[in-house]
């Protein structure tokens, strides 16, 4: 349905606020160094121009797409070539070109101070002070920092920030009430960046075809009673809005994702038993739930697969006929049949079955040559299920700090040439699995395990992309999305690396440690432990495990000095000598 | 008792529609395909369809376009729809239960009564 | 595909061996998808042979299949007052849509 006016017709849809919002969201995310205050400025321009084209959207410019609009718009920053570089380039590029090289200079890793918290009365005042204000700046802050954060979701974590302000500004004890909820919606918030960005990645680097086949089977295993026609329409249409947002159509999103919902709940009955209640919120909460909603019951008495898919001579018929409608049944009935899967291996089960198809096809004989695929499946499936396994006992054994530890060890021998700070941060992440999964029965640990790795994996590859340094990094994340995680559990220790200089101030430590929280002091001592396996990658378990219980000692014992600096320079090198004879460096 | 009991049938003007209803009873559909045959008065049997359990629809040439075979397995029915009728169209139908799951083995082990369609003005 | 059945009537009597032939115009799927079924007026159909030659349930042994690929044979080894009928074979062929039934074959008391 095309209209005179695009800019009129989403800021009549989403109502002047959600437009602010979103803008601010889209321009954040676009320049991540430009202040708060240039923003703010640009959104209001656009504000004001939007409102001109709903009171006549024959009014001058009304009719130039969204992205000559915006584009426009970001291109009038005075300090673009001095703050960006040659982002400032794109300025020269019509669209859609020129939008197409902004979303290519998105920075994953931006260099940008680390947020920090002030004092609960600081933020209480400003709340108070100016609410709109406050609650766009959060709104900034996320999005410069998160360039791929599904906007109308970062709307509800405003609301939700906004809600915990006007709740616990009044409370008694403002902290109490306080900083659980921020803790909760920054580590959320963490999580939910990490999952937007993806189904991005997926999107852009693999093609929509991935993105289908990804939403084809999570949505099979979410609504196992809907029928295969539905399930695709569902899939056409979170498809549209998960290009729109990583494409940066930011309001176009938001709009079609509110359709999307309203869809869902005008249909839940041939949807799905479990939309209930998330049909009855607002909006917002509303696509949250239902983007959350747990995996209705499967129908009783479920034909067998085989029939259709193995048994039936009319196989490479259907296939030849169809072939990704074909594929696309073969993975929602599995799928549907199986929410014990996680989705990759659904995907990689679905591979195996198109494999095996396009040979047996051109078969003399097609039936005797994929009668046998189910059996190529076991396999398939019983690695996560072993791997999953061992790591979740692994997990019971030494707790989750340790746990991290044994990754970091693990991942750092695999790639060593990627940075510290990532391999610290990419192997933390991997060693909250056992925290969040470990807890599951059988039936839900391998779709909360591979799933939540393969997100972690993405941040790897994302954050590798932007400056490579390890072509077996490059080569599992860009060969095979579904097989990432395999391709990384499947790296040994990389032989070809040259083991780093031994440097004595990456391992000299400051009074400054015994501040810092317990989650900072083991960003501390895990980066230590990174650097020591790249200075000797040949190191044993039990080498690494003495030094670091040395240098947990040694953090111990300082802090409680009286003369803590004194402390860590004469117990350092101490320290520092010992580990090297420790591990004969 | 397992049956399958056909229903839907009658008169109808040359141009019109019919939906036709194959209710089993004693079994789970969701176990084996499901197809219709019609037999046109004094005269031979003639395959109209089939649908798999999983949903997939094969169908005569002649048929193809004007019939459609569905199922709705919480039913426990199998559904012909016919449109554009013909006074050709004529017929007792069926509804046959294949041996096998997937495609269409030509061994209907389960019939229906069938139920009698005229199609005249 | 064409289902041609021989002879489209026959009479014979109780207790006499009885043969009906059917062929395709191109083979049945895996050589053996063909079935024999058995109608009686006011009934639907009912069937007594598939795959060729694997005898349903509940069906007499005096009934028997054989044949491959277009070929095929019913046999009634001895004729019973209840075999009088018509018999229809069908076949299956490599799709599920152009499956077929034959003509059709009368058997009526001598």
């Known amino acids: 349905d095309a209209h005179k006016s695009e800019v009129a017709h989403r800021f009549k849809d989403l109502g002047e606020e959600n437009f602010k919002a979103l803008v601010l969201i889209a321009f954040a995310q676009y320049l991540q160094q430009c202040p708060f205050e240039d923003h703010v400025k640009l959104v209001n321009e656009v504000t004001e121009f939007a409102k001109t084209c709903v009171a006549d959207e024959s009014a001058e410019n009304c009719d130039k797409s969204l992205h000559t609009l915006f584009g426009d718009k970001l291109c009038t920053v005075a300090t673009l070539r001095e703050t960006y570089g040659e982002m400032a380039d794109c300025c020269a590029k019509q669209e859609p070109e020129r939008n197409e090289c902004f979303l290519q200079h998105k920075d994953d890793n931006p260099n940008l101070p680390r947020l920090v918290r002030p004092e609960v009365d600081v933020m209480c005042t400003a709340f108070h002070d100016n609410e709109e204000t406050f609650l766009k700046k959060y709104l900034y802050e996320i999005a410069r920092r998160h360039p791929y954060f599904y906007a109308p979701e970062l709307l509800f974590f405003a609301k939700r920030y906004k809600a915990a302000f006007t709740e616990c500004c009044q409370a008694a004890d403002k902290a109490a009430c306080l900083l659980p909820k921020l803790d909760e919606l920054r580590d959320e918030g963490k999580a939910s960046s990490a999952k937007q960005r993806l189904k991005c990645a997926s999107l852009q680097k693999f093609g929509e075809r991935a993105f289908k086949a990804w939403a084809v089977a999570r949505l099979s295993q979410r609504f196992p009673k809907a029928e295969f026609a539905e399930v695709s329409k569902l899939v056409t249409d979170l498809t549209k809005v998960h290009t729109e947002c990583c494409h940066g159509d930011l309001l176009e999103c938001a709009d079609d994702r509110a359709d999307l919902a309203k869809y869902i709940c005008e249909n839940q009955d041939s949807i799905s038993s479990k939309l209930k209640e998330c049909c009855e919120k607002p909006l917002l909460e509303k696509s949250h739930c239902i983007a959350e909603v747990e995996n209705d019951e499967m129908p009783a008495d479920l034909p067998s697969l085989a029939a259709d898919f193995v048994e039936s001579k009319d196989v490479c018929k259907n296939y030849a006929e169809a072939k990704d409608v074909f594929l696309g049944m073969f993975l929602y009935e599995y799928a549907r049949r199986h929410p014990d899967y996680s989705v990759v291996l659904l995907l990689r089960l679905a591979k195996t079955y198109e494999t095996t198809l396009e040979k047996c096809c051109a078969a003399a004989d097609p039936h005797e040559c994929y009668a046998k695929v189910f059996d190529e499946f076991k396999p398939l499936v019983e690695e996560p299920q072993n791997l999953i396994k061992q790591n979740c006992e692994l997990f019971e054994q030494l707790g989750e700090y340790k746990f991290q530890n044994a990754l970091l060890v693990r991942y750092t021998k695999k790639v060593p040439q990627v940075s510290t700070p990532t391999l610290v941060e990419v192997s933390r992440n991997l060693g909250k699995v056992g925290s969040k999964c470990c807890k599951h029965p059988e039936a839900k640990r391998m779709p909360c395990a591979e799933d939540y790795l393969s997100v972690v994996l993405n941040q790897l590859c994302v954050l590798h992309e932007k400056t490579p340094v390890s072509d077996r990094v490059t080569k599992c994340c860009t060969e095979s999305l579904v097989n990432r995680r395999p391709c990384f559990s499947a790296l040994e220790v990389d032989e070809t690396y040259v083991p780093k200089e031994f440097n004595a101030e990456t391992f000299t430590f400051h009074a400054d440690i015994c501040t810092l929280s317990e989650k900072e002091r083991q960003i501390k001592k895990q980066t230590a432990l990174v650097e020591l396996v790249k200075h000797k990658p040949k190191a044993t378990k039990e080498q690494l495990k003495a030094v670091m219980d040395d240098f947990a000692a040694f953090v111990e014992k300082c802090c409680k000095a009286d003369d803590k600096e004194t402390c860590f320079a004469e117990e350092g090198k101490k320290l520092v000598a010992a580990s090297q004879a420790a591990l004969g460096l | 008792e397992v049956q399958l009991v056909e229903s839907g049938g009658g008169r109808v003007q040359p141009g019109g529609s019919l939906r036709l209803s194959c209710a089993a009873s004693g079994f789970s559909l969701s176990s084996n395909a499901m197809g219709w045959v019609r037999q046109a008065p004094g005269k031979g049997l003639e395959y109209i369809g089939i649908?798999?359990?999983?949903?997939?629809?094969y169908y005569a040439s002649w048929a193809k376009g004007r019939f459609t075979i569905s199922r709705d397995n919480s039913k426990n029915t199998v559904y012909l729809q016919m449109n554009s009728l013909r006074a050709e169209d004529t017929a007792t139908y069926f509804c046959?239960?294949?041996?096998?799951?997937?495609?269409?083995?030509?061994?209907?082990?389960?019939w229906g009564q069938g139920t009698q369609v005229t199609v005249s003005s | 595909i064409q289902m041609t059945q021989s002879p489209s009537s026959l009479s014979a009597s109780v207790g006499d061996r009885v043969t009906i032939t059917c062929q395709s115009s191109e083979s049945v799927y895996s050589n053996n998808q063909l079935s024999w079924y058995q109608q009686k007026p006011g009934q639907p159909p009912k069937l007594l042979i598939y795959d060729a030659s694997d005898l349903a349930s509940g069906v007499p042994s005096r009934f028997s299949g054989s044949g491959s690929g277009t070929d095929f044979t019913l046999t009634i080894s001895s004729l019973q007052p209840e075999d009088f009928a018509t018999y229809y074979c069908a076949g299956g062929f490599s799709s599920s849509s152009d499956t077929a039934f034959g003509g059709g074959t009368k058997l009526t008391v001598l």
């Open positions: 649908i798999s359990v999983g949903g997939f629809t």
């Open positions: 046959a239960r294949d041996r096998h799951g997937g495609d269409s083995s030509g061994a209907f082990y389960l």
